[in-house]
Interface confidence: low
C-alpha cells in the first residue's frame, strides 16, 4: 500500500524529537532543559520496557546528527546503553559486546515499529 | 524568506482585552520558540514570554502571569499575545520574535516581527 | 530575576570613534555543560525591531559587520565598535539569554555629533 502522510510524518516527528532533545545537556536555554530531560526520561523507559533502540534502529544514532552524539564519544557509545540486553538488575548483559553491535547483546528493532501498532488502532 | 507579521495597531479602551497576532512565512513555527517582547515609549525591552508551537507550552516572565497569554495555531502558522485588564502602562509596542530549534543548536532571537502598537486610552 | 546593568546609558562620540559599552549581570550566564555564556545584544534603530549582532558574548550573528565586537564572561561583558558610523545611531541592548525570565539591560543610547 501506499505511504499516507501520516505514515511518513509520525516517525520523522519522533526522530526529530529524539535527535533533538535525548541527553541534550546544553539546551537553548535553561528553561528548555526540563523539555530534555521529559524527552530523555521517556525514551529510557521506552528502551528498556519494549527492548527497542531509537525510532528505526541503533542505526539512528550512526547516521544522524544528534545531541546524544555531541554528549558522547562513538567508540564509549556508539548508542544509548538503554539500547544494550539488559540483565534482571537492568545492567547490561555485556557492555563492550553491546558497544561492539554482537548479535545479542543489544536491541537491533526500532521503537516506532513496536508502538505504532497500537497508535494506529485509535 | 523569514518573515512575521504582525497585526495592525489597537486603540483600546482601559479595562479590556486585546489579542495581538503574529504570522510566520518562510518557516513552520512548529520548529520554533516564539516570545514576545514589550518596548514602552522612553523605555528599554521587557521579554514578556515565549511559546512551543510544537506541544503548546510557555513560559512567562513573572511579571506578565498575570497579563499576558501567549498562543499559538499551527495551522495557519501564527502566534498570538492576548493582554487583559488593560492600563496606561500597557501603551506599548509589542514584538514577537522567533528563537529557530534544531539538534540542539543554539539560535538568538534573529527574527523580529514589525512590532504592534497598542494605546490603551479613555 | 537576574538583573542587567548597562552602562552608560547614552553617549555621544564622532564618527570613525572607538566606543565600549558594558553590560553586567546579577548573575553568572556561563553555561558549564558547553562553557558559552548566554549574552545576547541587539541593536534598535527608531521606529525598527531590534536586531540580533551578538550571541553567546562574542558571536557574531551573520552579516553583521566586523566593526562590532562582543567580549567578557560570567558577568562582566562589553560590546565594542570599532570605528563608529553614522548607520550605528541606535540604542543597544543586552540581555540574559540563560534563564527566565529573559531581561534586558535598561540600554546604551549611542548619539553621532
Known amino acids: 500500500t501506499a505511504a499516507t502522510q501520516q505514515d511518513f510524518f509520525t516517525p520523522n516527528l519522533f526522530l526529530k524529537q529524539m535527535l533533538e532533545r535525548y541527553q541534550n545537556n546544553s539546551p537553548p536555554n535553561n528553561d528548555d532543559q526540563w523539555k530534555n530531560n521529559g524527552v530523555t526520561k521517556t525514551w529510557d523507559r521506552l528502551m528498556l520496557q519494549d527492548n527497542c533502540c531509537g525510532v528505526n534502529g541503533p542505526s539512528d544514532w550512526q547516521k544522524y546528527t544528534s545531541a546524544f552524539r555531541t554528549e558522547n564519544n562513538d567508540a564509549d557509545y556508539p548508542w544509548p546503553r538503554q539500547c544494550c540486553v539488559m540483565n534482571n538488575l537492568k545492567e547490561p548483559l555485556n557492555l563492550e559486546a553491546c558497544k561492539l553491535g554482537v548479535p545479542g547483546f543489544y536491541h537491533n528493532q526500532g521503537c516506532y515499529e513496536l508502538i505504532s501498532g497500537p497508535m494506529n488502532r485509535h | 524568506e523569514v518573515q512575521l507579521q504582525q497585526s495592525g495597531a489597537e486603540l483600546v479602551r482601559p479595562g479590556a482585552s486585546v489579542k495581538l497576532s503574529c504570522t510566520a512565512s518562510g518557516f513552520n513555527i512548529k520548529d520554533s520558540f516564539i516570545h514576545w517582547v514589550k518596548k514602552r515609549p522612553e523605555e528599554g525591552l521587557e521579554w514578556i514570554g515565549w511559546?512551543?508551537?510544537?506541544?503548546?507550552?510557555?513560559k512567562y516572565a513573572p511579571k506578565f502571569q498575570d497579563k499576558a497569554t501567549i498562543t499559538a495555531d499551527t495551522s495557519s502558522n501564527t502566534a498570538y499575545l492576548q493582554l487583559s485588564s488593560l492600563t496606561s502602562e500597557d501603551t506599548a509596542i509589542y514584538y514577537c520574535?522567533?528563537?529557530?530549534?534544531?539538534?540542539?543548536?543554539?539560535?538568538?532571537?534573529?527574527?523580529w516581527g514589525q512590532g504592534t502598537s497598542v494605546t490603551v486610552s479613555s | 530575576d537576574i538583573v542587567m546593568t548597562q552602562s552608560p546609558s547614552s553617549l555621544t562620540v564622532t564618527a570613525g570613534e572607538k566606543v565600549t559599552m558594558s553590560c553586567k549581570s546579577s548573575q553568572s550566564l556561563l553555561n558549564s555543560g558547553n562553557q558559552k555564556n548566554y549574552l545576547t545584544w541587539y541593536q534598535q534603530k527608531l521606529g525598527q525591531p531590534p536586531k540580533l549582532l551578538i550571541y553567546?558574548?562574542?558571536t557574531r550573528e551573520s552579516g553583521v559587520p566586523d566593526r562590532f565586537t562582543g567580549s567578557g564572561s560570567g558577568t562582566d561583558f562589553t560590546l565594542t565598535i570599532s570605528s563608529v558610523q553614522a548607520e550605528d545611531l541606535a540604542v543597544y541592548y543586552c540581555?540574559?539569554?540563560?534563564?527566565?525570565?529573559?531581561?534586558f539591560g535598561s540600554g546604551t543610547k549611542l548619539e553621532i555629533k
Open positions: 553567546w558574548a562574542s
Open positions: 520574535a522567533r528563537r529557530e530549534r534544531f539538534y540542539g543548536i543554539y539560535y538568538a532571537l534573529d527574527y
Open positions: 511559546i512551543d508551537p510544537e506541544d503548546g507550552e510557555t
Open positions: 540581555q540574559n539569554d540563560y534563564s527566565n525570565p529573559f531581561t
